[in-house]
Each structure stands twice: as structure tokens, then as C-alpha cells.
């Protein structure tokens, strides 16, 4: 027989099928031109040694072979013995270690027979009442097709399912959608209508996330905050990747989970923008103040569950870096500056109160002054911090105040509102004899106690009411009495007591008489 | 491992008051953060409060006022106080552990370790 042509004798080896579980399958034969056909297949299993042979039966029941070699594609014309307008049925016998093995039959006609792509090029994934509609546009020049898929998950084999009869320049196919597990698709078309045509090959995969993206599984941790005003985010464990069937592992476009931090900064309530979402891969640096955090997982169908998180705020007080001075046009702040064109927010609330309550107030970017110090002053009118409490105070700084991730905070500290200097003055000054020549005095705690760091000293004042003679006594804030010692018998004295902040020299408390009584011996 | 056990619960009519308390082992509890979720038969489970290792709290705003958390490191030991209690408080209450610093999960996924409950009823 010459190659080219159908040989109608017995093919050189026996005729009989081993059974095998490998061997050629997925056999593909159709019209390439005028007057030329092609058959292509697939052999699953060692290859080496192999022989293949495209079987052909007529409908006349003459049978015919084409002997291919190693090779899984042949082509032959109109004139090669095989009947192209009538039904032919075609396999492929390989034979291989001393057994032969067949292909499943295909019946066609062969001029009818056009060779059908695949779906080629995008795509589209998209969700639909609970399941899922793919859609593409049709190959060129083959509009009328039978579609199906096979789809299959990381534990699951490969299971067909069929999209029906396609009709138009665009295809579409509904499959089932998973709830929690990720799948891979692929597609094939045939010719509609035309008995027997050969299937195309399978698309390339098409890989789809569940329904529901995983629920991120992170853990957190926030550094202390630094010197800058600012503290570290850190991420302790990433989120859990999602498990791929085969074919969608390694660069899987359509099945990537989407992890976005979302940051609600709870302080400061002024401020132009207060949320800020960032991919999760960017830890971001924060300032000291009360946060809460989300992290949001999301697939090209939605969002799913989110965590969250609070961060409280730093309350960590600088006793020191801020100076208040109250004159009589209203109060002045005074801090170190950081940097040029700074906006500040400056935040008060009074203590032992809801966070919510806090009040604050933005200023306009500003340079340092001479001194290297920004500022905030408020009137008496404005009733701001006007309550004589204790108020606790945080400010915060950006060049960029729209920027949520930018603000960093300058200090914490506390501050008695109103006229601290009258509301702090010590109340209840009791005098008791202590020797013949000293006596104790005590008092209740200034108001300003109430205010870490807020009261500087307590201060006794002691006159001599025959000689006019006054004496002071520092007291350290967290002591209530003294002993005054070197006093005279039968001499009148009057004591007073102060309390003073460090910007703020405090109202002596009513004065308050006593003497020593002369002591008569018997 | 940490463990968790919760004591506590039981039956108290509406506007009374509980003190729920938490008992941690096997860690080394000042570092970790600890919580209080809730939970209605059928239904999600909800933070309720949070306290840091250096005692930093947060409150669900539907508690905020009217329950205070706080710790005692040295017994290892977390406590809810509940006072007020309305009907819609009634819930299981779990106890709940998460080896981090400075922040509060508000969901139950951000937590690690979790007590078997104690039974919080309020009656009208």
C-alpha cells in the first residue's frame, strides 16, 4: 500500500484490544481545505516504541488502515480511499509491547467535518442566581456549536457537564458555583448538528474562587510608640492562601483573594478624612491614637467576612512639653513644633469620660515660631476646656492632614480647665498642736490632684502676726500636711496653703489662726 | 496551650448586676489580650469587651457604660462586671485569649483560645 493512501489489507499485528488503561483517545477528524482532512489524537502513556494506526470503516463494511508511526496527527486528501461524503466510522489502534490498544470510535461524515476551536481568548466569569455564567465571543466562522465543560477542585476528579446548543456570535454556559472551594473549568465545542463531529480540544483552564472568599486569619500586633509620635502596625500571620486544583496552580488569574486593611482612626474627629483603606501587604505606621482596624477579604465576586480589630489609644503623658498660659483674653498653648507647615489637632476630653465625648479642634498649617513652639489659643467665650475639671489633652501633627496614615502624635498630658488657680485651693485646713514649739497642719487634696502631673507642689504659708515674719514650705503633691517647728508660745500666727501647677501659681486658702498656749509649770 | 475557664453566670432579673471572671493557664497571661464574646443560640458571636496586658479597654457600644472589664496579671485572672442588665443580655459568655500586644480583636476569628462559656440570664 502506498502511504498515502487507506490500506484495505490487515494491518501488520493481531487484532486485539489489551484492555489497557492507557492509549489513545480524544481522536479529532475534519476538513482543513478543499480537498484535505486531517485526524489528530492523543496517546496517554510511555510513548516510546508506540505505532499508530488510523483505522477507517466505509458503510459499505470494507475497512481500511493508515499507518502514522509515532506520530499523533495524519493527513490525507480526497483520493486516499476514504470516503469524505458518507458516514465513516474512524479509530486509532496503537500498538505497543506486543498488545495493541484502541481508541473509542468516531462516526462522521468528513467533508461536513469542521475542524472547532475551542473557546479562544477572554473569558468572562461572572455570577448569576447562585451559579455561574461564563461567557466568549464565538471562534471565527463557527457559529452553531454543542458546548461542554468539565470542571473539577482540589479534591475532586474532573466531572463533564454540558452547556447545550450555541446559536450566536457570543457563547455562554451556566456551571455550578462552589461555595468554599476553588475550581477549574475547561470548555470544548463541536459543530451543531453535523452527527459525529469530532469535539475540539479543551480550552486552556478557566479558574474560579469559591463563592465565598476565606475568612482572613490574621493576628496583629502594635509596636510601642516611637520618639517621632508614631508606632508600628505589624502583621503576626498571614492570611491562609486558598487551595487550587491542578491546573489553576501557579499563576491562576480569577482565583486571587484580595486582602484590604481598612483604618477608621477613632481620635481627633476633625479631621478632614478619618478612614483609609491599604493592601495588607503595607503595614502602616500610626499615630497614638484609638484606631479600628478591619481587614476585608474580597474575589471578583465581592467581599466576604471581615475581622476586626481596636487599638486603643497610646496614653503614655509628656508632663512636661506643653505650656499653658491663661491671661485675660483666653489661654495660649505653647509645644515644641515639628516641622514646618504642620497641621496640628488638638483633642480634649474630660477624664473619667466616655471616649466619645471628646472634643477637638484643627488648626491651620503653621511654621514654628522664634522660639521653635506651635500654638493654639481659645477665648474664654468659645467654653472650650471652660469647665475647672480635669481635662485630658492629645495633639496630633501632619503636613499631609488628609493623608490618615501621616498624623503622629506630638504629646498627651493633662490640664485643669477654668480658673484652676481658685478651684485648686486647698479646702479643710485643720491645725493641731504637735510639740511646744511645732504643730501639724493638714488639708483635704487641691482638686488638681485629680490631674496627673498637673499639680506641682502644695505650698504653706506661715506669718507671725507680732512680727509680721512670713515663712513658705514647699510640700511635695502628694502629701497633705507638715510640721511647722521653731514657733513661740502665746504668739498669734495665721497658716494658709496654695496649690500651684507648673504654669500657674495657685489662691491661698482662707487663713486660718492659731497660737501655741504658754505653758505654766506647777 | 492557655486554658479558659469561665465562672459566674446564672439567673438575675433586669437592672441587676453579674461579675463574670476568667481563669487563665498555661501561658503567660500579661501577654496576652483578652476578651469577653457573647453568644444567642442560633446566632453569630459578638465581642462584648476587650482589655490589653496593660489594661487598655474597649467596649461594645451596646454594653459601653453599663460593663467594665479588668485583670488581675498576678492570678491570672479576667473579669467582666455587668450591671443594668437588660433581657436582650442574656447570652452565653466566653471568655476569650490572643497572644498579642496593644490590640483588641472585635471578631471571633482574631482570637486564639476560648473558655467552654457560662450562662448569663436576665429575666423581666
Known amino acids: 500500500c502506498r502511504t498515502s493512501e487507506c490500506c484495505f489489507q490487515d494491518p501488520p499485528y493481531p487484532d486485539a484490544d489489551s484492555g489497557s488503561a492507557s492509549g489513545p483517545r480524544d481522536l479529532r477528524c475534519y476538513r482543513i481545505s478543499s480537498d484535505r482532512y486531517e485526524c489528530s489524537w492523543q496517546y496517554e502513556g510511555p510513548t516510546a516504541g508506540v505505532s499508530h494506526f488510523l483505522r477507517c470503516c466505509l458503510s459499505s463494511g470494507r475497512c481500511c488502515y493508515f499507518a502514522a508511526g509515532s506520530a499523533t496527527r495524519l493527513q490525507f486528501s480526497d483520493q486516499a480511499g476514504v470516503s469524505v461524503l458518507y458516514t465513516v466510522t474512524l479509530w486509532v489502534e496503537s500498538w505497543a509491547r506486543n498488545q495493541t490498544e484502541k481508541s473509542p470510535e468516531v462516526t462522521l461524515q468528513l467533508y461536513n467535518s469542521v475542524k472547532y476551536e475551542p473557546p479562544l481568548g477572554d473569558i468572562k466569569v461572572s455570577k448569576l442566581a447562585g451559579q455561574l455564567r461564563m461567557e466568549w465571543e464565538t471562534p471565527d466562522n463557527q457559529v452553531g456549536a454543542e458546548v461542554q465543560f468539565r470542571h473539577r477542585t482540589p479534591s475532586s476528579p474532573w466531572k463533564l457537564g454540558d452547556c447545550g446548543p450555541q446559536d450566536d456570535d457570543t457563547e455562554s454556559c451556566l456551571c455550578p458555583l462552589e461555595m468554599n472551594v476553588a475550581q477549574e473549568f475547561q470548555l470544548r465545542r463541536r459543530q451543531l448538528g453535523s452527527q459525529g463531529s469530532s469535539w475540539s480540544k479543551w480550552s486552556s483552564p478557566v479558574c474560579v474562587p469559591p463563592e465565598n472568599p476565606p475568612q482572613p486569619q490574621v493576628r496583629f500586633s502594635v509596636e510601642q510608640l516611637g520618639q517621632d509620635g508614631r508606632r508600628r502596625l505589624t502583621l503576626k500571620e498571614q492570611p491562609t492562601q486558598l487551595e487550587l486544583p491542578e491546573g489553576c496552580q501557579g499563576l491562576a488569574p480569577g482565583t486571587e483573594v484580595t486582602y484590604r486593611l481598612q483604618l477608621h482612626m477613632l481620635s481627633c474627629p476633625c479631621k478632614a478624612k478619618a478612614t483609609r483603606t491599604l493592601h495588607l501587604g503595607k503595614m502602616p505606621y500610626l499615630s497614638g491614637a484609638a484606631y479600628n482596624v478591619a481587614v476585608i477579604s474580597s474575589n471578583q465576586f465581592g467581599p466576604g467576612l471581615n475581622q476586626t480589630w481596636h487599638i486603643p489609644a497610646d496614653t503614655h503623658t509628656e508632663p512636661v512639653a506643653l505650656n499653658i498660659s491663661v491671661g485675660t483674653n483666653g489661654t495660649t498653648m505653647y509645644w515644641p513644633a515639628r516641622a514646618q507647615s504642620m497641621t496640628y489637632c488638638i483633642e480634649w476630653q474630660p477624664v473619667g469620660q466616655d471616649g466619645g465625648l471628646a472634643t477637638c479642634s484643627l488648626t491651620a498649617p503653621q511654621d514654628p515660631d522664634p522660639a521653635g513652639m506651635a500654638t493654639y489659643s481659645w477665648s474664654r467665650e468659645s467654653g472650650a476646656m471652660g469647665q475647672e475639671k480635669c481635662y485630658y489633652i492629645t495633639i496630633f501633627a501632619s503636613a499631609h492632614p488628609e493623608k490618615l496614615t501621616l498624623w503622629s502624635t506630638v504629646l498627651s498630658t493633662y490640664h485643669f480647665g477654668g480658673n484652676a488657680s481658685a478651684a485648686g485651693t486647698p479646702h479643710h485646713v485643720s491645725v493641731k498642736n504637735h510639740s511646744l514649739d511645732s504643730v501639724s497642719v493638714d488639708w483635704a487634696p487641691s482638686l488638681l490632684s485629680t490631674c496627673p502631673g498637673v499639680l506641682k507642689e502644695y505650698v504653706v504659708r506661715c506669718r507671725d502676726e507680732d512680727s509680721k515674719q512670713v515663712s513658705e514650705h514647699p510640700v511635695q503633691p502628694t502629701e497633705t500636711q507638715v510640721t511647722l517647728s521653731g514657733l513661740r508660745a502665746g504668739v498669734a500666727y495665721t497658716v494658709q496653703v496654695r496649690a500651684d501647677t507648673a504654669w500657674l501659681r495657685g489662691v491661698w486658702s482662707q487663713p486660718q489662726r492659731f497660737s501655741i498656749e504658754v505653758q505654766v509649770s506647777d | 496551650q492557655v486554658q479558659l475557664v469561665e465562672s459566674g453566670g446564672g439567673l438575675v432579673q433586669a437592672g441587676g448586676s453579674l461579675r463574670l471572671s476568667c481563669a487563665a493557664s498555661g501561658g503567660p497571661f500579661s501577654g496576652y489580650v483578652m476578651g469577653w464574646f457573647r453568644q444567642v443560640s442560633g446566632k453569630e458571636r459578638e465581642f462584648v469587651a476587650g482589655?490589653?496586658?496593660?489594661?487598655?479597654?474597649y467596649f461594645a457600644d451596646s454594653v459601653k457604660g453599663r460593663f467594665t472589664i479588668s485583670r488581675d496579671n498576678a492570678k491570672n485572672m479576667v473579669y467582666l462586671q455587668m450591671n443594668s442588665l437588660k433581657p436582650e443580655d442574656t447570652a452565653v459568655y466566653y471568655c476569650a485569649a490572643v497572644n498579642s500586644f496593644g490590640v483588641i480583636p472585635t471578631s471571633p476569628n482574631g482570637m486564639d483560645y476560648w473558655g467552654k462559656g457560662t450562662l448569663v440570664t436576665v429575666s423581666s
Open positions: 482589655i490589653t496586658g496593660i489594661s487598655s479597654t
